[in-house]
């Protein structure tokens, strides 16, 4: 979908402490040019997104995990 | 800049029906939520809905099932909000919300007035 | 639905004084020890703002004179010191579940 706008970095803040069972799924941005960074963008059960740390070791293992189930399916 | 921009204000007739937009800028809708919201002259905020563009899926306050329908079309960055069947209990100001957390923007609001 | 409660309706707090706003839920708003539970300003003619998302978390660019609090069913939010640009109609909203609800609102005058 072409979209006219610049876009940028989304996450300008990450959310802390959300746990993994409050999440539906993440979405994974890789660097480019509208962004330099990694960015993680979790999708919650309750009609919300929020931006999660990327270098955190609880969200690696949660895109670990989402990502294995997704090759599962 | 990252915002919200709603179309403007409408009257409209009873009985007939409304379509209001909000277009995003400076972020893409497919990954957020828009949420849409209404409020009364002098009366409190009101939950009418939310889809999730990335994939058309809606949810809806019971009391708007019928009343009110949200879409979105991600080529335009453009969520809508349509209201059929007009009456003056709808004469309100209607706000779609960015939902993120951490960064929640809102429109600027539109004011849709219900008179013959 | 979950029906919210705020208390009290409208207060009227001195400059630099603490204000307190209370937001009890029918039900709990929690899932897995996050609490859905969101605080937002309104000022005249102007959208809500977010303040407090997920009960204690602070939004982007919001002072640190506010903050929240709480978990399940009772909720607060503080102001403190309150300022004169504070002067506002705060409502509490969960999103724990569908449908989400708002509180009717509790409007901040400052003396």
């Known amino acids: 979908a072409s979209v006219a706008t610049e876009l940028r970095c989304q996450c300008l803040q990450t959310l802390q402490g959300i746990h993994p069972k409050n999440i539906q799924s993440v979405n994974v941005k890789s660097p480019g040019p509208h962004c330099a960074q990694t960015e993680v963008i979790a999708t919650l059960k309750n009609g919300r997104k929020a931006c999660l740390n990327p270098a955190s070791p609880i969200v690696k293992k949660i895109i670990e995990k989402m990502l294995n189930s997704d090759k599962s399916n | 800049e990252l915002q919200l921009q709603q179309s403007g204000a409408e009257l409209v007739k009873p009985g007939a029906s409304v379509k209001l937009s909000c277009t995003a800028s400076?972020?893409?809708?497919?990954?957020?939520?828009i949420h849409w919201v209404k409020q009364r002259p002098e009366q409190g905020l009101e939950w009418i809905g939310r889809?999730?563009?990335?994939?058309?899926?809606?949810k809806y306050d019971p009391k708007f099932q019928g009343k009110a329908t949200i879409t979105a079309d991600t080529s335009s960055n453009t969520a809508y909000l349509q209201l059929s069947s007009l009456t003056s209990e709808d004469t309100a100001v209607y706000y779609c919300?960015?939902?993120?957390?951490?960064?929640?923007?809102w429109g600027q609001g539109t004011l849709v007035t219900v008179s013959a | 639905n979950i029906v919210l409660t705020q208390s009290p309706a409208s207060l009227a707090v001195s400059l630099g004084q603490r204000a307190t706003i209370s937001c009890r839920a029918s039900?709990?708003?929690?899932?897995?020890?996050?609490?859905?539970m969101h605080w937002y300003q309104q000022k005249p003619g102007q959208p809500p703002k977010l303040l407090i998302y997920?009960?204690?978390n602070l939004e982007s660019g919001v002072p640190v004179r506010f903050s929240g609090s709480g978990s399940r069913t009772d909720f607060t939010l503080t102001i403190d010191p309150v300022e004169a640009d504070d002067a506002a109609t705060y409502y509490c909203?969960?999103?724990?579940?569908?449908?989400?609800?708002f509180g009717s609102g509790t409007k901040l005058e400052i003396k």
């Open positions: 909203q969960q999103n724990n579940e569908d449908p989400f609800t």
């Open positions: 039900e709990s708003v929690d899932s897995y020890g996050n609490s859905f």
């Open positions: 889809i999730d563009p990335a994939n058309g899926n809606t």
């Open positions: 400076g972020f893409n809708i497919e990954d957020t939520f």
């Open positions: 997920l009960a204690s």
């Open positions: 919300e960015e939902g993120r957390y951490g960064v929640a923007y």
